[in-house]
């Protein structure tokens, strides 16, 4: 039954029938209001001294526009044992970076430095299996470099930049370990999120993700902020760098499924992704021919005698896709946003280790400068076919 005549949307919200929503409708809210029924506004939010209520697309939020003015910021010297305090715009308006041997949100916890020597991969079995392109669980450990990268999208140590005294790869345990809650330590696998929720209308939100139409019921972190459909008026906030992913789906299939793909990866990274465009505005998704043809290409460059038919027989087995991270919503709702693509790539590698990827990713790279050839990708000005191939294998 059409419930819209009952005017379920408050504060001037417009009701639209949506048969696949649990309540049978969805509200489109006017500026200043949010929530499933447009029931939320700044009027109901009491902010602390120095904070200002700003209505965001995710609802009303208290922000500290000038951290020096706010309660419980760094002014109260909250970080113990020589920890460094960093002002934050959201409560509690600071975060502590702790020195070695201390942890906790105020560096109040002493953690005795572990004297255990780093484990070594002693199994001959694992030595034989490493880097064979197959993830073997018996070798999927830090000591064995995650089966030589076979279990971690070719990245042998996703935690290489993590300076915590804890072995953070051992603390993916469904509980918050503050010492691992940094970008370099992959935000403790996002286990420190206070309001870790699942998307209430997941099927609906997946179907309406990134469709250029704002659905307020999907405009939350757990629903991927509706693919930024509700933030089109906000400036982009791009992380530095490019994520380069090889996935075993051909380009046409990947592009057809791109909204689901971007939503799935964005959910893991707790932010939004988009496909990078080249200088001509074309999406940077290219055919991937696999490592075998990379070897064949080497042979071709030395002998230059490969028959054309053989070259054309190369089979496309996947795609190489170039992605950018847009943090415009992440920075409003969280302080766990990736400033560059290095840690984001490492987090995807850690999900591969855990076996929680829903797409057949083969490798992930982070390129902090413009990728070689990317500017020219698809622009039609290649010197010859070899040059074009470089793009696929760089």
């Amino acid at each position: 039954a059409d419930v819209c005549p009952q005017k379920p949307c408050l504060n001037g919200g417009t009701c639209a029938v949506a048969s696949n929503m649990p309540d049978g409708f969805i509200c489109r809210c006017p500026p200043g209001f949010s929530g499933a029924r447009c029931q939320s506004s700044c009027g109901q939010v009491k902010c602390r001294r120095g904070e200002q209520c700003i209505h965001t697309d995710s609802g009303p939020r208290c922000f500290c526009l000038n951290p020096k003015d706010c309660e419980s910021g760094c002014a109260s010297n909250p970080c113990q044992h020589g920890g460094t305090c960093y002002p934050q715009r959201q409560p509690p308006h600071y975060s502590c970076r702790c020195p070695p041997s201390f942890g906790g949100s105020h560096c109040e916890l002493y953690t005795a430095p572990t004297s255990t020597p780093p484990a070594t991969c002693q199994s001959q079995y694992c030595a034989d299996k490493a880097r064979d392109g197959i993830c073997d669980e018996a070798c999927n450990s830090h000591a064995c470099q995650w089966d030589g990268g076979d279990c971690s999208l070719t990245m042998e140590d996703p935690w290489a930049n993590c300076t915590s005294t804890l072995r953070c790869w051992e603390y993916i345990n469904n509980q918050c370990d503050e010492q691992c809650n940094t970008a370099e330590c992959l935000f403790d696998n996002f286990e420190c999120q206070r309001n870790s929720k699942t998307c209430k209308y997941d099927k609906y939100c997946a179907d309406h993700f990134k469709d250029n139409h704002c659905d307020q019921g999907c405009n939350s972190e757990e629903c991927g902020w509706d693919g930024l459909d509700c933030a089109s008026d906000q400036p982009e906030n791009l992380a530095e760098g490019t994520l380069i992913i090889v996935v075993l789906l051909p380009p046409e299939q990947l592009l057809q499924d791109s909204r689901s793909f971007l939503r799935a990866l964005g959910t893991l990274l707790h932010t939004n992704l988009r496909i990078k465009q080249d200088s001509q505005g074309a999406l940077m998704v290219y055919p991937y021919f696999g490592e075998k043809s990379a070897a064949m290409k080497k042979q071709k460059m030395t002998r230059r005698s490969l028959p054309e038919e053989q070259e054309q027989e190369q089979e496309v087995i996947g795609s190489k896709i170039f992605l950018e991270i847009d943090n415009r919503q992440c920075v409003q709702d969280s302080d766990q946003c990736f400033k560059n693509t290095d840690a984001a790539a490492a987090l995807l590698a850690s999900h591969a280790i855990q076996g929680t990827l829903s797409y057949p990713l083969v490798s992930v790279f982070s390129e902090l400068e413009s990728p070689r050839n990317a500017r020219r990708a698809g622009s039609g000005d290649y010197k010859d076919d070899d040059d074009k191939e470089n793009l696929y294998f760089q």
Partner: antibody, heavy 122, light 107 residues
């Protein structure tokens, strides 16, 4: 619908050769590992070999190493088991089975073919 | 190689009975264990993976438990279509090995 269909079984003399095929359909063939598993008459299941079509990497049981070769043709969506130097103890129904985890050999086999009988006898 | 030992090798039960089959690994395989059902002349069918996760479409009367070296498959209320042979399999380390099977027969 995901489907695997084996073919190529038959009667062969000891020392002979046979090539089994497993035609896959309904999924991205190169993304999933494939194993051959055999079952001797009235006996239990024995894992024989594994291949990850994307990388071409292979694993074998000791009992067949050096005699059997697993391969895959991604353009035909087909896996093969080339069996040489066959022995009486290789007599079995041979099943191909898809692994459920993309590049992980450490995953269960969620789709099986109907099997093809190989008989090694003089 | 990792040895998998299943018990019992066969059992007789009636429709409605609760049936338990155990599987023991010769070394720690964490939770990398699957259970398969096989009927005469048919291919095996995956029931449980990850020691306790039911494959989609498998009835809820089938459940798996355990980790490390000791595992159990339980059929809470045996149905006529459940009379078959059941195999456990470790997929932690290659070669992946199966238990010798448990035949569930009608009493």
């Amino acid at each position: 619908e995901v489907q695997l269909v084996e073919s190529g079984g038959g009667l062969v003399q000891p020392g002979g050769s046979l090539r089994l095929s497993c035609a896959a359909s309904g999924y991205t063939f190169s993304s999933y590992g494939m194993s051959w598993v055999r079952q001797a008459p009235g006996k239990g299941l024995e894992w024989v070999s594994y291949i990850y079509p994307y990388s071409g990497a292979t694993y074998y049981a000791d009992s067949v190493k050096g005699r059997f070769t697993i391969s895959a043709d991604t353009s035909k969506n087909t896996a093969y088991l080339q069996m040489n130097s066959l022995r009486a103890e290789d007599t079995a129904v041979y099943y191909c089975a898809r692994h459920s985890g993309y590049y992980r050999i450490s995953s269960a086999m969620d789709v099986w073919g109907q099997g093809t009988l190989v008989t090694v006898s003089a | 190689d990792i040895q998998m030992t299943q018990s019992p090798s066969s059992l007789s039960a009636s429709v409605g009975d609760r049936v338990t089959i155990t599987c023991r690994a010769s070394q720690n395989i964490k939770r990398f264990l699957a259970w398969y059902q096989q009927k005469p002349g048919k291919a095996p069918k995956l029931l449980i993976y990850g020691a306790s996760t039911r494959e989609s479409g498998v009835p809820s009367r089938f459940s798996g438990s355990g980790s490390g070296t000791d595992f159990t498959l339980t059929i809470s209320s045996l149905q006529p279509e459940d009379f078959a042979t059941y195999y456990c399999q470790q997929y932690y380390r290659s070669p992946h090995t199966f238990g010798q099977g448990t035949k569930v027969e009608i009493k």
